[in-house]
Structures are given as C-alpha cells and as structure tokens.
C-alpha cells in the first residue's frame, strides 16, 4: 500500500510492482508501495549468518559512471530476527534501508521461504525522501496468523543490477497440536492384532499422545508423537481416537470405528431381467458385505418340476455387476434360483429362492426318418417322417414346414408347405416331370421353426414310368440318395 504523508495519510492497496514513491520539492515524507521488476538481471547477496555483528547485507554496487563515481554500499538495517506468537494473533514486522538518491531506481519486495510474496498481501512501504537520501521502511503485517504463515521472511531490494537482501525474520506461529496423521477406520479380522497411528506437531513441541478406546484412555503414560498403538485383537466393534497435548493445550483426533469382519448377509431382491428358451438373466442386490469386500457369487439353479431328480446346477461369477445370465437351460421349464456371495470370511446364506421359467423355443432337431414316394397313379409325392424327440422339441409342436425344390433342365423352383401338428405324413402334387424333387422338413413350435432335415431327392420321370421304391433320409455320411426309375 502507499500513502503520501502531507496533511493526511491515504492508504492504497499493495501491488507487486515497481517501487514507488514521490519526491516532492518540499521533501515531506511519503508512503508508497513495494516491488517491481526492472529490466536488469539480478545478483543475489546471501543472508548473513545469524549472530554476525552486522546490520544487514551489504552490497557494494559495481556500476560506475564514465567519471568512475562509485556508489556507496547499501545494507538493510538489522531488525528483530525471531517472532514467536500464538495462532490467530496479529503480527507486524519491517525492514528498513536508506538509499542515496543517486541510485535513482530501486524496487523492493517481500519473500517468504524463497518465494516472492505477490498480490494483495498486507505490505506497506513508507518512503521518506530528502535532498540526498530516501529512507525506506517496508512493513509486513498479518492480521490473524495461521500455521501456514510460519517461515523465514526477507526483504529484497533490486538496485543497479544487484539485489540487496535483508536478514531473515523467522515467524513461529504457536498453537494447539495439529494432526499430520490421524487414525484411520479399519475392518479387521476377529482376534487379530492391528496398528493405529497418530502424529501431531506444534509448535510448540513436544507433542504427547494419549490413545482413547470407547471413551476410555488406553495408555496411562503419554507417548511422544508420532505414536503407534498395537491392538492385540477385538471381538466386537470399537471406536478409537487420540489426544495430542502440548503447552498450548490439547487437540482430539476424529474418532474412528474399527469393525470386525464377518460373513456377508444374503443377497436380496433377486429378480428376473429377461428369459429366453435356454437362458435366464437375473440380477440381485448384494446384502451387507460384513466389512470385507465381496469376492464372488454363486447362482444355484434347481428344476422346479416335482418329477425332476432335484439336482442343483451351480454357476460361479464375479461379485460385480450383480447380474448373471444362466445358460444351457431347457425350454419351457420351471426353475428355482438362489444367489449366495462370499467375502474373505466365508459364504453368505442363500437368498430367498425365486421361481423362473424359460420360454418356448424353436425345435433344436429336425424330424427323423424322412421318406419320399412317388404315387404315379395320383401324380403325387407322398412324404413320411417321425416327429423329433419331445425333449428336443423345445415347445409344443404346432406343425411342420416342408420345402420341396424341383429341378429340371437348369430350372429350379422351391415351394413351401405347412402341415398341422398331428400328421406325420404329407402329399404334394408333382410340379414337373422328368425332374428331381428335393424334400426337407422342419418342425415348428410357437417359438419358431427348427432346423430342416437333410435333403431327400427323388427323380420324377416322364408319364408312363413306374415307381418301384421310395427315397428316404440317408444314413449319416452317405451321399444324397437319388432314386432313378
């Protein structure tokens, strides 16, 4: 901040700029502001060692004019070296220097622990110019000191390419102990030893530590900070804290809860997210983890059919994301599903069982023993088959789909027929003579169309030929059967 002292004092905010002031011809003292950097590079003058009989750091500038006029040495006047005060109190300290006006251009700045104090710090620099010398008093004030204000403060004056450095002023802010490490909440195994750490600092030192468990002191004699408490083991939850004492008083740490690890609670809210013919997607809400992270979960699946053998299928999965798709299930089947999860201590009980059903699917196999006959008298092709095994129908049969392809002289035509669920034979009209007819049959449920059977071919001769034998589904591995009449 700056002030010109004439009839009145006018305070101005501080800025990190050039070193101001205004010399009036009447030589009245004037208050002005701090530091600004000029163009010049700077030479550092190290602070003198504490206790040296000397009034600050002297710089004898090397610059001289054409007439070789040496500039006189400059030094900050000695000031208080160490200030001890309590937290939240105010403090003001200063450095002063008399600068002959022949220097003509100076800047001054405050530094703390090697860093320049820029911005709106509470710094005021007073200037008292007269004909030959300008007296400069740079003051620094802190209205309510905090621990972070601890440190070494110096003034630097930049003048004619050099820096003059004041002796350091050490500010020591004393207060209640300040925790640098507090005990942390923990989850521990029953009857297993563990450690808690507490560390606090002053000033003032020393800082002594007492441990407290469930509101009772653990140690009768204090321990010097830092302190490590070894707890031999717990059988139930406990709350620990530590007290830090110094000459200014005591500070109590946060209370931390030490929990005993246990098996988890069973999952809740197992629900069906989606069902298909052969899979069920389930989700669940994990129960309480027993103060130990879940490791994995187990999904147990039982057929709900009273006639089933009661065997349980088990699917293991990771604990996250509380979602699992159970696969390899039968279509149109009912299942009971339960979930259990584990942590390092053990498995939870199984969740409440829920009922779930798979949906109807398309058959998984084609009709069996497909045979094809040519009935020349009626100009029809007779087709016969056996329905797929019930287990592989994956639903209730609603019929069959017959594909017959007619090929003759490079022309090919496919036709589709639908047949009701009760039949196991069909008759189709001959579409083309002197052609090959290829027949395939698929079973159909409400879940969809199953796979087609292997093709069976029969040759349809021109009118007047005789039908001697049927064509039938070949044994596996044989070439397509073709009956030529």
């Amino acid at each position: 901040a700056i002030t010109e002292a004439r009839e009145e004092a006018k305070p101005y905010p501080l800025f990190p700029g050039p070193f101001p002031g205004s010399l009036q011809t009447d030589h009245t003292p004037l208050l002005s502001l701090p530091h600004a950097s000029g163009y010049q590079p700077a030479l550092m003058f190290s602070p003198t060692q504490p206790g040296r009989p000397h009034t600050g750091n002297v710089a004898i500038p090397q610059v001289t004019s054409v007439e070789s006029k040496p500039l006189p040495p400059l030094a900050f006047k000695h000031t208080v070296g160490h200030i001890i005060l309590s937290e939240h109190k105010g403090v003001k300290f200063n450095c002063s220097i008399s600068v002959p006006n022949i220097y003509q251009d100076t800047t001054i700045s405050w530094w703390k622990d090697g860093k320049e104090l820029l911005g709106a710090h509470h710094a005021i620099t007073q200037f008292y110019p007269d004909d030959e010398v300008t007296a400069i008093i740079a003051s620094f004030s802190i209205t309510s000191v905090q621990r972070s204000d601890n440190g070494s403060y110096i003034c630097k004056m930049k003048i004619n390419n050099e820096e003059i450095v004041s002796d350091p002023i050490y500010i020591e802010v004393q207060g209640l102990p300040h925790f640098t490490k507090q005990p942390e909440s923990m989850n521990v195994t029953r009857n297993t030893a563990f450690n808690l750490t507490c560390q606090a600092v002053g000033p003032p030192e020393p800082v002594n530590i007492f441990w407290v468990q469930n509101s009772s002191r653990v140690n009768e004699q204090p321990e010097k900070s830092p302190s490590v408490l070894t707890v031999p083991g717990l059988t139930e939850m406990a709350v620990f804290s530590c007290e830090a004492h110094n000459d200014k008083g005591l500070t109590v740490s946060k209370g931390v809860q030490i929990n005993i690890k246990a098996i988890p609670s069973p999952p809740t809210e197992v629900s069906i997210r989606n069902s298909t013919a052969h899979s069920i997607l389930i989700s669940w809400v994990p129960g309480f983890d027993g103060y130990s992270p879940f490791r994995n979960c187990s999904i147990q699946v039982k057929e709900a059919d009273p006639l089933s053998n009661g065997s349980v299928m088990i699917f293991n999965t990771s604990a996250l994301p509380h979602l699992y798709q159970i696969k390899q299930l039968q279509a149109l089947a009912n299942y009971s599903i339960g979930v259990s999860c584990m942590n390092e201590i053990g498995w939870s009980a199984v969740s409440p069982w829920i009922l779930a059903s798979t949906t109807e699917g398309a058959p998984s196999v084609a009709p069996l023993n497909v045979t094809v006959f040519l009935n020349e008298s009626s100009d029809n092709v007779d087709i016969r088959w056996m329905k797929p095994p019930t287990k592989q129908q994956d639903g209730e049969l609603v019929g069959y789909r017959i594909s017959h392809v007619w090929q003759s002289a490079g022309i090919s035509k496919e036709l589709l027929e639908e047949v009701g669920q009760n039949g196991s034979r069909a008759r189709i009209s001959v579409q083309v003579h002197n052609a090959t007819c290829t027949v395939r049959i698929a079973a159909v449920t409400r879940g969809g169309v199953g796979p087609f059977s292997d093709p069976v071919k029969i040759f349809i001769p021109a009118h007047g030929w005789v039908d001697y034998a049927p064509s039938s589904t070949p044994a596996p591995g044989n070439a397509d059967p073709v009956l030529i009449i």
Epitope: F15, F19, S22, A36, K69
Partner: antibody, heavy 120, light 107 residues
Amino acid sequence: QVQLVQSGAEVKKPGASVKVSCKASGYTFTNYGMNWVRQAPGQGLEWMGWINTYTGEPTYADDFKGRVTFTTDTSTSTAYMELRSLRSDDMAVYYCARKSTVVSRYFDVWGQGTTVTVSS
Amino acid sequence: DIQMTQSPSFLSASVGDRVTITCKASQDVGDAVTWYQQKPGKAPKLLIYWASTRHTGVPDRFSGSGSGTDFTLTISSLQPEDFATYYCQQYRSYPLTFGQGTKLEIK
C-alpha cells in the same frame, strides 16, 4: 524553481543524426534519473528509456536499442539524447522528463520539448 | 510489455459536466498508474500518481481510482481549462508504457 530546458527545433535529412540537450536547474541533477519520451504528430507518448545521471548508466526501450544514445554532463547538469539513422517516422517532439524519486517511475517535471523534422 | 488501453479516444462534454476516462492494463500493475494532462503544443503535466494520489497543485476536482488492471480518472465538474488530452501510464515494470490518449473536447 525546478525546470528542464531543451535545445531548439532541428531539421534533419533521412539517415542523419540528431542530438537533443536537456539542461536541468533548481535541483541536484545527479539525484534524479532522466527519461526521454517522444510524441509523433497527432500521436501518443512513447517512452524511449532513461539514464542514471549519477552513474551514466542508460536503459533503452527495445524499439530504440542500437540507434539511440543517452549521455549526461554533470558539470553542466545536462542530459543528451542522440538518435541516429533518422527516418521519416522519427519526426516527433522529443521530451526529457525527470524521474520523480529513487522509488518511482513517473515524471514530475518535463522539458518543453524539441521538435525534430526529418525531410529530404 | 504491458499494454495500456484508454477509452474513450474522444470525449465531448460541457463545462460543469462530470467525466470519467478509463484505462485498462493488459496485466496486473497494482497501483502503479499515473495520469498526465497535455494541452496542444505543451509538455504533459503530472496529475495523479499511485492511481489515486493527486500531485502538488492539482485541483481536487481531479480524482483517480482503481488497482490491478482497471483504472479511472474522473473530473467532477469540468472547467474551461480542463479541455485537453489525458494519458495514463503504468510503471509496474519496464518498459514504461502509456495509453493512447483521450481527447476531451468542448461539446
């Protein structure tokens, strides 16, 4: 009273040099820095640099480095500004101005100005 | 370099008016701003330094304010002799720089 008196107007050809003087009176010459500021016709103020009148050490603004020289004669309390290799855009009024104190960088006393005309 | 931008460049006002001229610095200059008045054919005159301190002999109708990057010069009641060009200057750091000027004319 404190005053700065500058030399008279100059007319120069492009490429020539000009030297402007500034005589101080009413104060101790070597206790105050001397700044030089110029002003082209109808334009604003442009700082050229300053000289420590005690040590003779100059500080030049980047735009003028290598083309300007500041000197002083303490026996006559006079500061000089020499500008070389004149161009048409150097046509301006050149002012000397006293730096207010050791701890300030503004100007409390100004010369009356010297008009420099550059014309072929 | 720190740029100083003045506004407005021209200002028309009448005797008795209150006028304000602003100056904006391109970076924080604290309070290190001064204001000069210049009349045609004359050298500039120091009005205000440290943003708000009036120089010796400057009438109290002139006042300055601001800190950091924004500064103002206010003339509370214009007098005939106040019609001139006004310049701000920063002296936070070298090179010293001026605003481009504000010409105050009679309306």
